[in-house]
């Protein structure tokens, strides 16, 4: 090889050992029979050399540095050449470095031809091995602007006082052009400006200077986004840290053309703007840091650009001004992550503050819109608390558990609407009365409606799930001893059409000791399946539940248990079941931890089934499933 560097070229070539590898044989640079491991060639020098091994690319790297001095004379602006040409260089991983020094008052602009650049974070690498490392200067301090790959959106980077650009090319890469040019600009009065151009939909992840280390103190950095007017941009902060400020405040400022409130100032912890049409600027402003404990300011953010959907121009009013203790959350429904670019799906408050989820609280009227390609990617979860603190005031008071129509009119599917019903301890209990009798969901007779009510205890220490209930059954009412949550869960978009079938009234009633009482009025010829609460986990210790089963005068009820034995094993106490005729008070008592369960029995009058649990040993829980079937009395039952 012969490398000759012209005099006055201000180029230095350095061939040195790269990252040490576990290669058995060493390799040397050979110059007139001398074996060396580092070779430096300066301007005006000509050196002939060879390598002592077949694969020097595994051992050595080559650095070509060109110093460009814009302080003492005119700057060589325009397209930057790869000098010496790559064809004259040995086949090694190579890094071309351009170090441009300029006056503080002069702005320098790096312009990248297509493909534009994509910034990468620490620990990331470029798929083709071609990386661009760009740094600037503040007085004598070097500031890392970032490391970039090809195929991105960054088209220009403006700096002042100097710039250092390193282009790393792997030995096998055919690239023979720098891919950028340098132009002079007036002073930019800040650390740097990065221009990011979107031709169409896409995303860009960008970072503050020196990331993941701290942004220079009291500096200003700007990103200019060029976005076609027909597209919408949204900003989300992926990661940030704030330093300890002594004076001024760290902030981001947005300049949004057409906005009447420019610049719009946000704290880093605020929700950032979304649904912005066309171009905009984002600036990061540091502060004067505490000398003793400065901390670090750093920011990594994403800009997502996508088509506005029809929905983004529609405003929905959610009036919660007359509601109390209620919150509505619109959020992404869980999905498997796909690797391809998926446009963002945002919900926007007042059309501007967009995020992937949004919580609205009671007491206000909210205006929302959507920036989303497919609204089925979102769902709604609502929580409302109805509590009674004064038992004298609440007794016999009723509340309707109904999804407000404002919520039903939103273009997003309702997933859960949960009512938390709270009563004063040992003073009041609750009764749920459905508009349409309910069916309990069982494996034998599953619910196939578009929604169900999930009823569970709302006492933190109590793990008690009464079950899932849907319209179209025989359960007339459910009484519960203390605090519960009732969740209306939807299973199909057809809930919108079936919404009229929902309707549940809760009333506060005098306190009773049983955990729950189900009033069942079976319909003729239909088999009613009932099961103990906490199915699959077992009825909680020392819990008692009852079923009040009505039998019409002309009917007879057949009570059938689906197991021979309950399977419960008691650690302490006894588990028992009482079947009691309501008219005669005659009762049968079964020891559930000892006796076999009763064979199918016939009841001519209304009766009670009461099940009370012991403290079972783990793994031997109490789970019972039974059915009630009505038949006309005229049938010969023998």
């Amino acid at each position: 090889f012969e490398i000759a560097l012209p005099r006055e070229s201000n180029i230095t070539v350095l061939i040195k050992l790269g990252t040490p590898t576990l290669l058995a044989k060493p390799c040397y640079i050979v110059i007139s029979k001398r074996h060396i491991t580092m070779l430096s060639i300066k301007s005006g020098e000509r050196i002939v050399f060879t390598f002592s091994c077949q694969s020097p690319e595994n051992h050595f790297v080559i650095e070509i540095q060109k110093n460009i001095d814009c302080m003492s004379g005119p700057c060589p602006f325009g397209e930057v050449q790869l000098q010496p040409s790559t064809s004259l260089l040995p086949t090694l991983n190579r890094t071309f470095i351009w170090d441009v020094k300029a006056h503080k008052s002069i702005g320098l602009e790096l312009q990248f031809s297509i493909p534009r650049l994509r910034q990468i974070g620490p620990g990331e690498s470029c798929p083709d091995g071609v990386t661009h490392s760009i740094s600037g200067r503040i007085d004598a301090t070097v500031v890392r602007i970032g490391t970039f790959c090809s195929n991105g959106t960054v088209s220009r980077i403006k700096m002042q006082e100097g710039v250092k650009m390193a282009l790393h090319l792997p030995w096998f890469h055919p690239r023979n052009v720098s891919g950028f040019s340098i132009a002079n600009r007036s002073s930019i009065k800040r650390l740097c400006i990065i221009e990011s151009v979107f031709e169409g939909e896409g995303s860009a992840t960008l970072m503050s200077a020196n990331y993941p280390e701290g942004f220079p103190e009291d500096e200003l950095m700007t990103w200019q986004f060029v976005v076609p007017a027909h597209l919408r941009a949204s900003v989300s902060f992926l990661n940030f840290n704030l330093s300890n400020c002594e004076r001024k405040e760290e902030r981001v400022e947005y300049y949004i053309p057409g906005s009447t409130t420019n610049p719009e100032v946000f704290k880093l912890e605020d929700k950032q703007p979304g649904n912005m049409a066309g171009n905009f600027n984002l600036s990061l402003q540091g502060c004067d840091q505490d000398a003793q404990s400065p901390g670090i300011l750093r920011l990594q953010f994403q800009v997502l650009v996508q088509h506005p959907q029809n929905e983004s121009n529609k405003i929905y009013v959610v009036d919660l001004s007359n509601e109390r203790a209620m919150s509505l959350t619109i959020e992404p429904r869980p999905v498997k992550q796909s690797r391809k670019f998926v446009p963002g799906c945002f919900v926007c408050l007042e059309s501007r503050t967009c995020s992937s989820n949004l919580t609205l609280t009671s007491g206000s009227k909210h205006k929302i819109s959507f920036l989303c390609d497919d609204l089925t990617r979102l769902w709604m979860n609502v929580e409302k608390t109805i509590s009674c603190t004064d038992h004298r005031y609440c007794q016999r008071k009723s509340y309707s558990l109904q999804v407000p129509s404002d919520i039903l009119h939103l273009p997003v599917e309702l997933h859960d609407f949960s009512w938390k019903l709270l009563v004063p301890k040992d003073r009041l209990s609750l009764v749920l009365v459905p508009a349409q009798k309910l069916q309990q969901h069982t494996h034998e007779k599953p619910c196939n409606t578009s929604f169900s009510y999930l009823v569970a205890s709302a006492i933190p220490s109590q793990d008690l799930y009464f079950g899932s209930f849907c319209p179209g059954g025989s359960i007339k009412q459910i009484q519960v001893k203390q605090n519960i949550s009732v969740t209306l869960r939807t299973f199909a978009p057809s809930f919108q059409q079936e919404a009229s079938r929902q309707g549940l009234t809760v009333s506060f009633i005098p306190y009773f000791k049983e955990e729950g009482v189900f009033t069942v009025t079976p319909d003729t010829k239909s088999k009613v399946y009932l099961r103990t609460p906490n199915w699959d986990r077992g009825l909680p210790s020392l819990t008692s539940v009852s079923w009040n089963i009505s039998v019409p005068r002309d009917q007879v009820a057949c009570l059938t248990f689906f197991k021979e034995r309950s399977g419960v094993v008691c650690q302490t106490g006894r588990a028992f079941m009482i079947i009691q005729e309501q008219r005669t008070r005659a009762e049968e008592i079964f020891s559930l931890d000892e006796d076999v369960l009763p064979k199918p029995s016939f009841h001519h009058h209304s009766f009670w089934v009461n099940i009370s649990n012991c403290s079972p040993t783990s793994g031997k829980q109490l789970d019972l499933l039974f059915s009630v079937t009505l038949t006309p009395r005229t049938v010969d039952l023998t």
């Epitope: 077949q54 020097p56 690319e57 595994n58 086949t91 030995w171």
Partner: nanobody, 115 residues
Framework: EVQLVESGGGLVQPGGSLRLSCAAS????????MVWHRQAPGKQREWVAV???????NYADSVKGRFTISRDSDKNTMYLQMNNLKPEDTAVYLC?????????WGKGTLVTVSS
């Protein structure tokens, strides 16, 4: 001096497969870094796949999952198995080898993907 000769190119329908070979002579390059480049008419030459002297491989994003680079050290030959070919894969494919700090290139073989 190393000579390289590519073969295996031709006309293939989209979705089809081809296997390119690159035979080296003049020197033993069985343990050297080898690379495939391609050049489409009127376009910049681009890197496709590389196999290092240690045998590790790397692919350009555009061919990842479809192309496989391999070598047969005994035969001093490198291969490029190309599956699920697309019209945009149409190009002259050239193989190169890094040998004592020089890269030697073959003349190329034409691959045309068209229905």
């Amino acid at each position: 001096e190393v000579q390289l000769v590519e073969s295996g190119g031709g006309l293939v329908q989209p979705g089809g497969s081809l296997r390119l070979s690159c035979a080296a002579s003049g020197s033993d390059v069985s343990a050297n870094g080898m690379v495939w480049h391609r050049q489409a008419p009127g376009k910049q030459r681009e890197w496709v796949a590389v196999i290092s002297s240690s045998g590790s491989t790397n692919y350009a994003d555009s061919v990842k999952g479809r192309f496989t680079i391999s070598r047969d050290s005994d035969k001093n030959t490198m291969y490029l198995q190309m599956n699920n070919l697309k019209p945009e894969d149409t190009a002259v494919y050239l193989c190169g080898v890094a040998h004592y700090g020089q890269t030697y290139w073959g003349k190329g073989t034409l691959v045309t993907v068209s229905s």
